[in-house]
């Protein structure tokens, strides 16, 4: 039983699977969007260099009370090696450039699809 228990417990998720699941979640958000996402909240735009996942999380974590993106926030935290809390400002943000959450999610989705096609899973 002890041995079999190892099979039942989930192992680490392959990066390709994690990225695909994040893409699927963003697709769900963009397709199911009826009213303005998160009441039209604005977030910092981001640079797409290394650390992009943390920067995306740092932007989105500042949106509170928006259940539609809570799963995305949790999934992004799995890609970010450090703890992210609201109010942080990363050098990966584009200062003075805010965009709507809906556009941010849409653009992040486009970028992640490109990464997936190119096999860049981390």
């Amino acid at each position: 039983l002890t041995c079999l228990g190892g099979f039942a417990s989930p192992g680490p998720v392959p990066p390709s699977t994690a990225l695909r699941e994040l893409i699927e979640e963003l697709v769900n958000i963009t397709q199911n969007q009826k009213a303005p996402l998160c009441n039209g909240s604005m977030v910092w735009s981001i640079n797409l260099t290394a650390g992009m996942y943390c920067a995306a999380l740092e932007s989105l974590i500042n949106v509170s009370g928006c259940s539609a993106i809570e799963k995305t926030q949790r999934m992004l935290s799995g890609f970010c090696p450090h703890k992210v809390s609201a109010g942080q400002f990363s050098s990966l943000h584009v200062r003075d450039t805010k965009i709507e959450v809906a556009q941010f999610v849409k653009d992040l989705l486009l970028h992640l699809k490109k990464l997936f096609r190119e096999g860049q899973f981390n």
Epitope: S45, I46, N47, L48, I99, E100, Q103, F104, K106, D107, L108, L110, H111, K113, K114
Partner: nanobody
């Protein structure tokens, strides 16, 4: 709101040079492949040049190859088109646009007029 604002057009003599700029806002510019299209008076829209998101892959229509150079500065959210050795047939309204195959990602500016005439 997504905005693409072209500038740099004007009246120029044949053989002259112009540099068009396109200031992008309201979206994550660095994610998008971008390009320039043009529409000459009484003609259809012609794709002139495109550049990938990272700025390292470019495409040019045969009609402008060797004369036009596309570039981008992702830190400034700006797309450029350097136009040299201009000809009368380059007269057109030039539009900055996204160049993505993915549906729903197509945006275009209002255009800037380039007139090549002596």
């Amino acid at each position: 709101e997504v905005q693409l604002l072209e500038s740099g057009g004007g009246l120029i003599q044949p053989g002259g040079s112009l540099r068009l700029s396109c200031a992008a806002s309201g979206f994550i510019f660095a994610v998008y492949d971008m390009g320039w299209a043009r529409q000459a008076p009484g003609k259809g829209l012609e794709w002139v040049s495109s550049i990938n998101d990272g700025g390292n892959v470019t495409y040019y229509a045969d009609s402008v190859k060797g004369r036009f150079t596309i570039s981008r500065d992702n830190s400034k959210n700006t797309l450029y088109l350097q136009m040299n050795s201009l000809r009368a047939e380059d007269t057109a309204v030039y539009y900055c646009a996204t160049a993505e195959d993915e549906p729903g990602y197509d945006y275009r500016g209002q255009g800037t007029l380039v007139t090549v005439s002596s």
